[in-house]
């Protein structure tokens, strides 16, 4: 029958070549000579000449070793023709299957594989995967079946087998407890890939396992006890730098220190921050210290990390003994700003008040007083007692020096220390009013018509305060009341002047006497211009009208 089963040819055959594979035979050769030929890739098309056929005998010949990794199967066609060239059979399919030999070693996809795992992880945790390929047949044979193994581990600490590898997937897992980055930050594994499912050819690669840091080390103080000396009263003064060591990765959150004052700072005098470069705790004063109140502070400082501890760890504590150094402190006025009342116009030499300072220092020092700011030169101070007396006439109404009834004075107290120090006190003199000003009308010129005149209203002011001010009373004197009338408004702060009788156009002087509620009288001359006009007039008398 004109059929042929598949021909299995092992790759890498040693020959001799040409090698007879199989014989084609047509049963139609009884009365005629048959010629055989083959076509297809490997015969008459690329790769040409791998296979040929003996034209007359029909033997299929192989001319060279085959390579399964290049071509797994050749599909050829066998032809049978008679002497005259006529086809005597249909083209016959010839399948030549190249069978595998273990002629390829496994190859890792990388020379070096890199992976990482957190220190202290559970045995069983997977780390990374390595991959090798083998060009041989892994379906019908074990030639291409790769088995992975770990050949060696460096360093061999704490055990020589810290990792294992899945035989068929190449997944590397932790097998032992004790991964500690601070002891071994990196492992180098020589991994093997062996074909024949572990029984054949071997190739190696390197797997580098980086051990990642966990915050499994607490920062520790080095040293644990500190002593510092700080001048009193200084704010922001650097008291001490506290140094810590931490075995975790430098400049990582597991290494960066966070400091807390956990005891000894009841008055909230101190603060501690982390120095960004050195990781030291910088202890500074938040408030000034007071030698006289407390000459020593014992602080307890705790240190943790920016990152939370990965495991339960003891927290380190340092002790800082802060000695407060005494400095010559300035005397302090009590109160620093003193408000007192003084009557304006008191006699020179009269006592205004006593304003004294206290020296915070323990040793008795002599305090002397001076006035540093007294813009009107109204006051004097006794250098020994701090008694303040009038040296000029205090005037509440002096707007240059007195604002809102208050006259501000600065007093200095200087101690006898070496060097001496000076404290400042502010004396706020609230000046009480006396009736030292009379009422004044405004304006002091009026213009009025001599026919049906409109009364002219003047405003009355008095620099004094109530009750030495409004309501006011008005009176015309020196016979001014013959032609004129003065009438104070109901509110008592304006006066209306009006003509009682006809006056010819001219300028007249009126004597207006105004008295305040405290009966202080003030005489003011009012210049009145009378015009020939009716009703109201403004600015000037109207010019007489001349007919044409």
């Amino acid at each position: 029958e004109w059929v042929m089963p598949p021909i299995f040819v092992p790759e890498n055959g040693k020959g001799p070549f040409p090698q007879r594979l199989n014989q084609l035979k047509s049963n139609k050769d009884r009365g005629t000579k048959i010629f055989y030929s083959i076509t297809g890739p490997g015969a008459d098309s690329p790769p040409e000449g791998v296979f040929t056929i003996e034209k007359e005998s029909g033997w299929l010949l192989l001319h060279m070793p085959l390579d399964r990794e290049k071509i797994v199967k050749y599909e050829l066609y066998g032809h049978a023709v008679s002497e005259n060239g006529a086809s005597v059979e249909e083209p016959m399919n010839i399948s030549i299957i190249v069978t595998d030999q273990n002629d390829n070693k496994p190859k890792f996809t990388q020379d070096t594989f890199r992976g990482s795992v957190l220190e202290g992880v559970m045995p069983g945790t997977s780390v990374m995967q390595v991959t090798a390929t083998d060009e041989d047949d892994a379906v019908n044979t074990y030639n291409g079946v790769v088995a992975y193994s770990i050949h060696s581990q460096e360093p061999k600490e704490p055990h020589d087998l810290m990792f294992t590898i899945h035989k068929s997937t190449g997944t590397i897992s932790v097998i032992s407890s004790g991964l500690d980055r601070e002891k071994v930050p990196e492992y180098r594994l020589t991994v093997q890939a062996t074909d024949m499912d572990g029984e054949g050819s071997t190739t190696t690669a390197e797997a580098v396992v980086q051990i990642l840091d966990a915050n499994d080390n607490a920062p520790e103080f080095e040293p644990q006890k500190y002593e510092a000396w700080v001048p009193e009263n200084e704010v922001g003064h650097e008291v001490q730098r506290l140094t810590v060591t931490d075995l975790d990765v430098p400049n990582s959150p597991a290494w960066r220190a966070t400091y807390h004052i956990v005891g000894g700072d009841d008055g909230d005098h101190f603060t501690i921050t982390t120095h960004p470069e050195t990781n030291q705790g910088v202890l500074t004063t938040k408030k000034g210290l007071d030698f006289e109140a407390q000459d020593q502070h014992t602080l307890y400082v705790e240190v943790t990390n920016e990152a939370p501890f990965a495991v339960k760890l003891p927290t380190a504590t340092a002790t800082v003994v802060v000695h407060v150094k005494d400095v010559n402190e300035a005397p302090v006025f009590v109160p620093p700003s003193k408000v007192i009342e003084a009557q304006e116009g008191i006699s020179i030499g009269e006592l205004v008040c006593i304003y004294t300072a206290q020296d915070p220092d323990k040793e008795d020092q002599k305090i002397s007083y001076t006035i540093s700011r007294d813009p009107a030169n109204w006051l004097a101070v006794d250098p020994d007692s701090g008694q303040i007396t009038a040296a000029g006439i205090l005037d509440r109404e002096d707007e240059q020096f007195v604002k809102n009834n208050v006259y501000e004075v600065m007093v200095l107290a200087t101690d006898s220390g070496n060097p001496p120090t000076t404290g400042t006190g502010t004396l706020l003199l609230t000046l009480t009013d006396i009736n030292d000003h009379g009422p004044i009308p405004e304006p002091r010129q009026i213009i009025i018509c001599n026919q049906s005149p409109v009364p002219q209203v003047l405003n009355i002011t008095d620099k004094d305060l109530s009750p030495n001010s409004s309501p006011f009373q008005a009176q015309l004197t020196h016979d001014s009341d013959i032609y004129w009338m003065a009438e104070v408004s109901e509110k008592g702060d304006t006066v209306a002047l009006s003509l009682k009788k006809f006056l010819k156009q001219d300028t007249y002087d009126l004597h207006l006497s105004l008295s305040d509620h405290g009966n202080r009288e003030q005489l003011t001359m009012i210049r009145a211009t009378v015009c020939d006009c009716h009703g109201q007039v403004f600015n000037d008398c109207p010019r007489p009208w001349k007919g044409g």
Partner: antibody, heavy 117, light 111 residues
């Protein structure tokens, strides 16, 4: 001598709670992962829970997840298993064991936990 | 049902040899050389007798040996003694949680 010693077993009603302790000695306790394994009467061994050496990672069998809590105090060299919402099927001898190198070794002597009304 | 398969029981006479098999998969026994065997006497805790397929902890008799082929591991006991009568459990390291799988146990009877 490496030793693990359990305590705290006993009889408890369904829905009740119990805490097992396992005191370790003879090895650096904090360096080793630990496991709890149980064995129901007449049955085989069943893995229950595990914890890393630091105590930072914990793992549970599906059958106990959400009801049991594994913990450790490395300063006291002690492993714990807090068992809540106990069921009849939790009745077993509970063993603590060190886990590493692909094996469980050593084992504690075991503590019987009986869940019954 | 246990992840690893063991015969429920085996028996042998004193002086004889026996073998207990433990069959797993390509993800446990077949994948790793981390097969352990434990001996458990009635009322006692399991005791490790072999680790990493064939490593004996100190104090364990050399009559106990282990081997592995493919997905199956075996425990062999030679020169059976009366005190060998116990339950024997195999375990294997495995990929992923719970990282350890047990066999159902084999009861060894010394006749």
């Amino acid at each position: 001598e490496v030793q693990l010693l359990e305590s705290g077993g006993g009889l408890v009603q369904p829905g009740g709670s119990l805490r097992l302790s396992c005191a370790a000695s003879g090895f650096t306790f904090s360096s080793y992962a630990m496991s709890w394994v149980r064995q129901a009467p007449g049955k085989g061994l069943e893995w229950v829970s595990a914890i890393s050496g630091s105590g930072g990672s914990t793992y549970y069998a599906d059958s106990v997840k959400g009801r049991f809590t594994i913990s450790r105090d490395n300063s006291k060299n002690t492993l714990y298993l807090q068992m809540n919402s106990l069921r009849a099927e939790d009745t077993a001898v509970y063993y603590c064991a060190s886990w590493g190198d692909g094996t469980l070794n050593p084992w504690g002597q075991g503590k019987m936990v009986t869940v019954s009304s | 049902q246990s992840a690893l398969t063991q015969p429920a029981s085996v028996s042998g006479s004193p002086g004889q040899s026996i073998t207990i098999s433990c069959t797993g998969t390509s993800n446990d026994v077949g994948a790793y050389n981390y097969v352990s065997w434990y001996q458990q006497h009635p009322g006692k805790a399991p005791k490790l007798i072999l680790s990493e397929v064939n490593k004996r902890p100190s104090g364990v008799s050399n009559r106990f040996s282990g081997s592995k082929s493919g997905n199956t591991a075996s425990l062999s006991i030679s020169g059976l003694q009366a005190e060998d009568e116990a339950d024997y459990y195999c375990s294997s390291f495995t990929s992923g949680l719970p990282w350890v799988v047990f066999g159902g146990g084999t009861k060894l009877t010394v006749l």
